[in-house]
Amino acid sequence: DAHKSEVAHRFKDLGEENFKALVLIAFAQYLQQCPFEDHVKLVNEVTEFAKTCVADESAENCDKSLHTLFGDKLCTVATLRETYGEMADCCAKQEPERNECFLQHKDDNPNLPRLVRPEVDVMCTAFHDNEETFLKKYLYEIARRHPYFYAPELLFFAKRYKAAFTECCQAADKAACLLPKLDELRDEGKASSAKQRLKCASLQKFGERAFKAWAVARLSQRFPKAEFAEVSKLVTDLTKVHTECCHGDLLECADDRADLAKYICENQDSISSKLKECCEKPLLEKSHCIAEVENDEMPADLPSLAADFVESKDVCKNYAEAKDVFLGMFLYEYARRHPDYSVVLLLRLAKTYETTLEKCCAAADPHECYAKVFDEFKPLVEEPQNLIKQNCELFEQLGEYKFQNALLVRYTKKVPQVSTPTLVEVSRNLGKVGSKCCKHPEAKRMPCAEDYLSVVLNQLCVLHEKTPVSDRVTKCCTESLVNRRPCFSALEVDETYVPKEFNAETFTFHADICTLSEKERQIKKQTALVELVKHKPKATKEQLKAVMDDFAAFVEKCCKADDKETCFAEEGKKLVAASQAALGL
């Protein structure tokens, strides 16, 4: 359904408020260093232009594509060359190359200051003084730090952010009301950003087929009563939505997501019995709710998979007629029967099945060749099961902080070339799998754990891609999307690594550590642990544990001292000397 003016079409579909918010998100995700005021000015100009097109779709430039309009607008920024360097060269290109160029310059780790939360009274005053600007600033700050954040979902976060301030700024104890809500939004936001980053990486690095396979498996687990044709339709639509958002087409993405939510709710009966509550909510809440909805119950008396996919004489005929459809059906049937498997495991099984059919359907006796294909699945299923069991036992024994430390040591020894901040961030997140998933019963542990680990390892992959330093990381990240976790799990200590030269400055601490939050203090200690392993990769777990305990004793002692700074200076030197003597640093 072609429209004379795409910008007018989207403005009318989305409404002015959402239109402006989405354009702001799009611009902030592209030009991550630009000041807030500059972006607001650009958004207002685009909005005024859109309104002229709504009034008259034949008006000048209204027929231009959104990429052309937005790209032209971004290229008017005066300081583009000084601020962004070679990104300015994108402006010399024509669409669609210009947009591709902007996309390639999105920075997963922009050099931006950490967001510091002001005092509650200061925030409430700002909220009351100018609610619109306050909320726009939230969108801007999140979008520029998370250039792949799922834009329609960010609108939902902003709605909750507004609700939190509306409620809490008139509460008796503003802080007690507001701070937990902001903490929750921050943590959920980081998780949402990371999940979406994996979807975009899947589409951009491994292609639409990889994303569709993921979507078939996940939607089949979630909607096991839905027919294959229904799941296929949802997968096609969902792929379009995420392709658009990952490609910077945020207006189309939000519009199509709303259409998909509408379709799902109109066809609940043939999709899932769990959608009723979601479908009673307003649009943003509805879409979020559908995306998070629990798995429906499996239909009773599902027949054995073997009949259609192993025992049937028509397996090779059906496969040859439409390979991807047949594999899609296999994945659908396997996934709907196995909500207890991770999506990545289901995809590994489908890949094994595909490889077997490719080989066997060309053999003299195909049936004899593929008859035992399901036996090949057993080790693939047992590997994540055993890994999760071992790691949950370790987590229960150590607790989250020490479990994170165990992973820090493990991963630093595997890939010591990776930057310390990245190793700390990724290992801390890997360690959170314990609290997140180990509490679940057996049937929910694997989908929780392994699919979460896929999200976290993707963070490592995108951060490493910006500044590649390890061939082993590159190999695990690029060879196979579904085998990233097993690839990293299989890495042993890097014997080729030349230990980092000792630098006393790395192990110099100051009194400011005493006033840090517990989380920040942990990060300081974990940073020191990574550096220690980089200097002494052959140190045993016991030695590292003991040195970290010395560090804890040192910090505790100096934080109790009258002259803290002097204590840190003098005792810090002693700690370094003692550790050097003991470990031979």
């Epitope: 020490k402 010395d550 505790e556 550790s579 003597a581 003991a582």
Partner: nanobody
Framework: QVQLVESGGGLVQAGDSLRLSCAAS????????MGWFRQAPGKELEFVAR????????YYADSVKGRFTGSRDNAKNTVYLQMNSLKPEDTAVYYC?????????????????WGQGTQVTVSS
């Protein structure tokens, strides 16, 4: 399980010296810091010294700094507390303890295994 056995306590005059020993058996000795604590009659258990895993770093309570010296011999699974210039206020039962996996380094709760204690009495 870990067994810790202190020895070397006794009755001495103010200004004298004593050397306490603590022999460990059981769990790995060299991987853990060791602590000395003391308890005077009617008082709470008080931190005295922490000797790190390798014997290269020792922390003391202000009340004993400059007079007491902690050391360890990992080959013998033994930790020592050399006490010089003893004062009557040093009178207490002295305990050695092996560091646990969490908690404060300066608090009894941060230590998992304890000896039975050895009495030190300093007369004026």
């Amino acid at each position: 399980q870990v067994q810790l056995v202190e020895s070397g306590g006794g009755l001495v005059q103010a200004g004298d010296s004593l050397r306490l020993s603590c022999a460990a058996s059981g769990r790995t000795f060299s991987g853990y810091a060791m602590g000395w604590f003391r308890q005077a009659p009617g008082k709470e258990l008080e931190f005295v010294a922490r000797i790190n895993w390798s014997g290269t770093l020792t922390y003391y309570a202000d009340s004993v700094k400059g007079r007491f010296t902690g050391s360890r011999d990992n080959a013998k699974n033994t930790v020592y507390l050399q006490m010089n210039s003893l004062k009557p206020e040093d009178t207490a039962v002295y305990y050695c303890a092996q560091r646990g996996d969490s908690g404060s380094n300066y608090d009894p709760s941060g230590y998992s295994y304890w000896g039975q204690g050895t009495q030190v009495t300093v007369s004026s």
